[in-house]
C-alpha cells in the first residue's frame, strides 16, 4: 500500500526497484566453454533495479548513504542493488587430471539489497 | 602500468574508479541529532567511483555481471562500488533509560569492491 514502510514498497512502480531477476547465459556468453562442461546454459539470478531512499537498505551505512545522497547527490552516490546472499551451484569442469564437480558459493544471487 | 591486472589498475584515470572517500557529516545531516550525542561530526568513509570491466570484482558473480553487462547493457547493470568491509565506530546515544555507548559495526566503510 502507499503507506507501507519504504523498505518494502517500491515508490517507482512495480518491477522498478531493486529485485532478483533471472538472466539466461550460455557458457559461450561467460567465456567458460573451454573449461566448464555442464550445465551448457545457466539460469543466473542477478540483482537489478533502482534503490530509492531507504528501499531495502543493507545496513546503517546504506541508510546514511541514501540520506547523504539526497543532500549531496554530486558527491555521494545513491545506494545500488547488489546480492545480499547467494545460492550455491555445482559445475562440472575440466581439470589437469580429468573432470570434476566443483561447488561455487558466490555465483548465483539468491537475494538482493541496496548497499 | 598499462599492463597491470584490471583488478588493480583504473583504466578511467586517477580517482575515477571504485575507491574509499571521506565524507564529513554532522548529526543534523544524518537526522540523528535527537538521539546521538557524540561525536557531533562523523568522518564517514564511503565507496564511490565507477566499476569498469573486472575492476576490483567482489567475487565470481561480479565477474559474470561485468561480462553480461558488456553483452546486454540494457538488461544487466554494471557492477557497482560498495563496501567490502567496515570499521566499527562507537556512538554515544540516548536510550529510554539514559545515555550509553553503542558500537556500530556497519556504519563506516573500510574497503570497497565492485559487486
Amino acid at each position: 500500500s502507499a503507506h507501507a514502510h519504504p523498505r518494502d514498497s517500491c515508490p517507482l512502480g512495480p518491477g522498478r526497484c531493486c529485485h532478483l531477476e533471472t538472466v539466461q547465459a550460455t557458457l559461450e556468453d561467460l567465456g567458460w566453454s573451454d573449461w566448464v562442461l555442464s550445465p551448457r546454459q545457466l539460469q543466473l539470478s542477478m540483482c537489478v533495479g533502482e534503490c530509492p531512499h531507504l528501499y531495502r537498505s543493507a545496513n546503517t551505512h546504506a541508510q546514511i548513504k541514501a540520506r547523504l545522497h539526497g543532500l549531496q547527490p554530486d558527491k555521494v552516490p545513491a545506494p545500488c542493488c547488489v546480492p545480499s546472499s547467494y545460492t550455491p551451484v555445482v559445475l562440472m569442469h575440466r581439470t589437469d587430471s580429468g573432470v570434476s564437480l566443483q561447488t561455487y558459493d558466490d555465483l548465483v544471487a539468491r537475494g538482493c539489497h541496496c548497499a | 602500468s598499462a599492463h597491470a591486472h584490471p583488478r588493480d589498475s583504473c583504466p578511467l584515470g586517477p580517482g575515477r574508479c571504485c575507491h574509499l572517500e571521506t565524507v564529513q557529516a554532522t548529526l543534523e545531516d544524518l537526522g540523528w541529532s535527537d538521539w546521538v550525542l557524540s561525536p557531533r561530526q562523523l568522518q564517514l568513509s564511503m565507496c564511490v567511483g565507477e566499476c569498469p570491466h573486472l575492476y576490483r570484482s567482489a567475487n565470481t558473480h561480479a565477474q559474470i555481471k561485468a561480462r553480461l553487462h558488456g553483452l546486454q547493457p540494457d538488461k544487466v547493470p554494471a557492477p557497482c562500488c560498495v563496501p567490502s568491509s567496515y570499521t566499527p565506530v562507537v556512538l554515544m546515544h540516548r536510550t529510554d533509560s539514559g545515555v550509553s555507548l553503542q558500537t556500530y559495526d556497519d556504519l563506516v566503510a573500510r574497503g570497497c569492491h565492485c559487486a
Epitope: - | 557524540s38 561525536p39 570499521t87 566499527p88 565506530v89 562507537v90 554515544m92 555507548l101 563506516v108
Partner: antibody, heavy 118, light 107 residues
C-alpha cells in the same frame, strides 16, 4: 557492557618499575572513538587520572607524571598496559582502568592494589 | 590543570531525603562533567555524563545540573544503597581531573 580487570605485582620496592595490565571484554580498542584510561586512588584519598590511550594509539598523560608513565595496548588480546618507572611510597594506591569514549568513562575495573615498601 | 573542588567532604542525611552535592571548576568546563559513585568496596560507577545526562541503567532519582563552573548532583529520595562517596570529574581538557569526593552517610 564492558568488563575490565586490572592486574599488577601487589608489592614493589622503591625505585622499581610498576607494570600493570588491564584485560577487558565486551568491547574492542579497534573501535573508532574508543579508549581506555588508568586512574589511581591512594587509600582514603581522591581519584587521580594518569593516562589515556585511544583506538588509534594516540596517548595522553598527566603532565606532572609524564616522564615516568608509558601507556600501551595490544588490541588483538584486548589488553592495555601501564608502566610507571622509579616508584616511591607516594605511588602506593589502588590502580583502576576504565573504558571511555567522548569523555564518557562508563565502565571501571575493580582495581588492583599496589604497596611500595622497602 | 583545571582544579575541581567539592567543598563538602562528608554529608549526613536521612533515608528519603533530597541530597545535593556540589562541585566547582577553576574555569568554565562547558558541561564536560561526569559524576561517579564509589561504594565502600571500591566499586566505581558512572552516574551522570555531560553534567546532566543520566547514564543508562542509573535510577532516575539521580540527576545532574549546572553550567560554566558550578555543577551539582541531586539524589531526590535517598536510599540505603546510595551510601557511597561521590566524585565529579571534568573532561573539558587533559589532564582530566577529579573533585576530592563527598562521602554520603546515613544519619
Amino acid at each position: 557492557q564492558g568488563t575490565l580487570k586490572e592486574s599488577g605485582p601487589g608489592i614493589l620496592q622503591p625505585s622499581q618499575t610498576l607494570s600493570l595490565t588491564c584485560s577487558f571484554s565486551g568491547f574492542s580498542l579497534s573501535i573508532s572513538g574508543m579508549g581506555v584510561s588508568w586512574i589511581r586512588q591512594p587509600s582514603g584519598k581522591g581519584l587521580e587520572w594518569l593516562a589515556h590511550i585511544y583506538w588509534d594509539d594516540d596517548k595522553r598523560y598527566k603532565p606532572s607524571l609524564k616522564s615516568r608513565l608509558t601507556i600501551s595496548k595490544d588490541t588483538s588480546r584486548n589488553q592495555v598496559f601501564l608502566k610507571i618507572t622509579s616508584v616511591d611510597t607516594a605511588d602506593t594506591a589502588t590502580y583502576y582502568c576504565a573504558r571511555s569514549a567522548y569523555g564518557m568513562t562508563d565502565y571501571w575495573g575493580q582495581g588492583t592494589t599496589l604497596t611500595v615498601s622497602s | 590543570d583545571i582544579q575541581m573542588t567539592q567543598t563538602t567532604s562528608s554529608l549526613s542525611a536521612s533515608l528519603g531525603d533530597r541530597v545535593t552535592i556540589s562541585c566547582r571548576a577553576s574555569q568554565d568546563i562547558s558541561n564536560y562533567l561526569n559524576w561517579y559513585q564509589q561504594k565502600p568496596d571500591g566499586t566505581v560507577k558512572l552516574l551522570i555524563h555531560s553534567a546532566s545526562n543520566l547514564h543508562s541503567g542509573v535510577p532516575s532519582r539521580f540527576s545532574g545540573s549546572g553550567s560554566g563552573t558550578d555543577y551539582s548532583l541531586t539524589i531526590s529520595n535517598l536510599e540505603q544503597e546510595d551510601i557511597a562517596t561521590y566524585f565529579c570529574q571534568q573532561y573539558n581538557m587533559f589532564p582530566w581531573t577529579f573533585g576530592g569526593g563527598t562521602k554520603l552517610e546515613i544519619k
